[in-house]
């Protein structure tokens, strides 16, 4: 089989026939050096998954539940291409499983026990697997058989396709539990009708069901959605209030050597030639000899799944939790109101050591998880491997786009009521050596630059955003002659000045000596012309405050700030000479962990925060001798956010807009993956 062949897996005679037609029609339109199709027939989707894992086939299209199976070891497959529905302008690759209730009913998600439930059908995704999977650990024991546990949880249900003889309560609201449209409460519309008629208190459907059944907004306003955080939202806010976000139909391939670029090239060309309304003789999204053969008949086209996206991220935390609960059937010993330990994400070994010390001192209230980059940490928090970390504003933006929420903000100024008063922010500045007297904001081209890291606020987003507005392109590595911006591509001129050894060169963690505020300032001291840092960096590392050999003899007076008007000012005049105000660093977590992270961190700062006077003999949460490990070293306390509890509200409109503009220049693979899930 030539190298550019994609071996498509078919699961029936009809699929194999369509696959052969697909193969032949592709041959007729694609040059001989282009991608081609070969067909492999297997008895089932699970056999196809195994065949791809064993390198006997390359691709197959799967529903969400099977994407989960495909991801599990030893298969280790990943999503590579998604089918989309709707229009090319507004492509829908996901649907949302929701819990719909009547507006006046007054109960929340955690009060569903004893209510009457309407389901689309037993074993179906939005109507059964997701809600029951998420409620699984609240079901009465024994939880097997599952139908019995569900019957004992709700006071009555309509779950079409259930066995009405063995589990009569599941058919109480729709006698007989008929498994077709003959049952008026079957399917999405049926489950909604069950709620609408007053038979049930809650309907588990998908987000579009309400809109398809109620054209009139005034009618829709009689209903609400139950959110997982035990609040309610209007039905059109399903993106912020759902049980799970579910991919509709996805092509999977091997994680390693999986031909993902070739598969995309093939399918992209296929949709050009044989997509919706393209060709009479062969149609990719049509099944004359059956239904949904190879691809869904309702699909409109394909979108490439970003390479950073593994199956866990693609399926989302809620969906994976629901399906894992159903499959594995494991729950904590007894559900308690006690918070589980918070799994803190630590970057590289320096932060891990501090985190371990915190863990020991917290007596297990804190556990530690390691990752090599901030983005890897954010991904671990998203998928539940970790729970929380403190982030610079630039990463609060990425985390927010990935569905995480800020919970507490670092405060840097001593005040009587520190924990109750989140600050307005700190200043992003450009520092130069006083001796380089001709250097101004207007003649930085060709100079050597020092940055905290790519994607961070003071070190990147603010200065590069301002620069972008001036030069109108993203080739910052051409603007500066060389520099150190940890997280840049290793062959970039913006890694040339970095000092990390071997693989650690230019890494966005403390293994790179020029990483972070202190690192960027050190870069200026030793090699650079300008450093982009925070207003406190120079005083914190001069006058003997940093005992490291490179810093111990530095004098604040030997450095100046560049002002945007082309002038320069002494370091202490940052309030009148800065690039922008930056939002303080903040702790982020998943929505489901928000309350516990808040509670445990407030306890921890009372034990190990700024009130600890002797850090040589005691653990201090906000100290690491200028290394800013886990938290900035100048943190005085972690403050409540009050109503600034989303990333947009926390960062502020101006900063969100600035980072949004810089998105054109973003190299963040995680941001790309997260905006695929939520454009």
């Amino acid at each position: 089989v030539p190298d550019k062949t994609v071996r498509w897996c078919a699961v029936s005679e009809h699929e194999a026939t369509k696959c052969q037609s697909f193969r032949d029609h592709m041959k007729s339109v694609i040059p001989s050096d282009g991608p081609s199709v070969a067909c492999v027939k297997k008895a089932s989707y699970l056999d196809c998954i195994r065949a791809i894992a064993a390198n006997e086939a390359d691709a197959v299209t799967l529903d969400a539940g099977l994407v989960y199976d495909a991801y599990l070891a030893p298969n280790n497959l990943k999503p590579v291409v998604a089918e989309f529905y709707g229009s090319k302008e507004d492509p829908q690759t996901f649907y949302y499983a929701v819990a719909v209730v009547k507006k006046d009913s007054g109960f929340q998600m955690n009060q569903l026990r004893g209510k009457k439930s309407c389901h689309t059908g037993l074993g179906r995704s939005a109507g059964w697997n997701i809600p029951i999977g998420l409620l699984y650990c609240d079901l009465p024991e024994p939880r097997k058989p599952l139908e019995k546990a569900v019957a004992n949880f709700f006071s009555g249900s309509c779950a079409p396709c259930a066995d009405g003889t063995d589990f009569p309560q599941l058919c109480q609201l729709c006698p007989g539990c008929g498994c077709s449209t003959l049952n008026q409460y079957f399917g999405y519309s049926g489950a909604f009708k069950c709620l609408k008629d007053g038979a049930g208190d809650v309907a588990f459907v998908k987000h579009s069901t309400i809109f398809e059944n109620l054209a009139n907004k005034a009618d829709r306003d009689q209903y609400e959605l139950l959110c997982l955080d035990n609040t309610r939202k209007p039905v059109d806010e399903y993106k912020d209030c759902h049980l799970a976000q579910v991919p509709s139909h996805t092509v999977v391939a091997r994680s390693m050597g999986g031909k993902e670029d070739l598969i995309w090239e093939l399918l992209n060309q296929a949709q050009e030639h044989f997509g919706k309304d393209k060709s009479k003789e062969f149609q990719l999204f049509s099944s004359p000899h059956g239904k949904d053969l190879l691809f869904k008949d309702s699909a409109h086209g394909f979108l490439k799944v970003p390479p950073r996206m593994d199956a866990k991220m693609y399926l989302g935390y809620e969906y994976v939790t629901a399906i894992r609960n159903l499959r594995e059937g494991t729950c904590p010993e007894a559900p308690t109101d006690e918070c589980k330990p918070v799994k803190w994400c630590a970057l590289s070994h320096h932060e891990r050591l501090k985190c371990d010390e915190w863990s020991v001192n917290s007596v297990g209230k804190i556990e530690c998880v390691s990752a090599e980059t901030t983005e890897d940490c954010i991904a671990k928090i998203m998928n539940g491997e970790a729970d929380a970390m403190s982030l610079d504003g630039g990463f609060v933006y990425i985390a927010g786009k990935c569905g995480l929420v800020p919970v507490l903000a670092e405060n840097y100024n001593k005040s009587d009521n520190c924990e109750d008063t989140p600050e307005a922010g700190y200043f992003a500045i450009a520092v130069v050596k006083k001796s380089a007297s001709d250097l101004t904001w207007d003649n930085l081209k060709g100079k050597k630059s020092c940055h905290t890291a790519v994607g961070r606020t003071a070190g990147w987003n603010i200065p590069m955003g301002l620069l972008y507005n001036k030069i109108n392109h993203c080739r910052f590595d051409e603007f500066f002659s060389e520099g150190c911006a940890p997280g840049s591509k290793k062959d970039s001129s913006l890694c040339k000045l970095c000092m990390g050894s071997g693989l650690n060169l230019c890494e966005p963690n403390n293994k790179e000596g020029y990483y972070g505020y202190t690192g960027a300032f050190r870069c200026l001291v030793e090699k650079g012309d300008v450093a982009f840092v925070k207003h406190q960096t120079v005083p914190q590392n001069t006058g003997g405050k940093n005992p490291d050999p490179w810093a111990k003899n530095l004098n604040e007076k030997d450095y100046e700030l560049l002002c945007l008007d082309g002038t320069r000012k002494p370091v202490e005049e940052y309030a009148n000479c800065h690039l922008a105000r930056a939002p303080n660093h903040a702790v982020v977590t998943r929505k489901d962990k928000e309350a516990c992270v808040h509670k445990i961190l407030r306890q921890q700062q009372h034990l190990f925060g700024s009130n600890v006077t002797d850090c040589s003999g005691n653990f201090c949460l906000f100290r690491s001798e200028t290394k800013d490990l886990l938290f900035r070293d100048d943190t005085v306390c972690l403050a409540k956010l009050h109503d600034r509890n989303t990333y947009e509200k926390y960062l502020g409109e101006e900063y969100v807009k600035a980072v949004g503009n810089l998105r054109k220049c973003s190299t963040s693979s995680l941001l790309e993956a997260c905006t695929f899930r939520r454009p």
Partner: nanobody
Framework: QVKLEESGGGLVQPGGSLTLSCAAS????????MAWYRQAPGKQRELVAG???????NYAGSVKGRFTISRDNAKNTVYLQMNSLKPEDTAVYYC???????????WGQGTQVTVSS
Amino acid sequence: QVKLEESGGGLVQPGGSLTLSCAASGSIFSINTMAWYRQAPGKQRELVAGITRSGTTNYAGSVKGRFTISRDNAKNTVYLQMNSLKPEDTAVYYCTDYSRKYYEDQWGQGTQVTVSS
């Protein structure tokens, strides 16, 4: 600077016991939390157990109930009593005092523990 020296490792059969010791010398007034780590071949170094100056202890889930960490402040020594040893406990065991405030990796030689029949 605090200097740490680990000892007490060896070869032991599954189910057996060992006690590791770590003696500290130097500017020990600054020692607060002490901990035992281990590193198996090809694996990351991981925290096994820790103890604060006041004697508060914490353990990795995999050793809870089998290992006990203790310290003798008068002798500036921390111990790790390891019972019901399993083959997966095989590793080089290191102790650390965290007084270096997480600067570079400054680990001692460690002591090898091998659990095998």
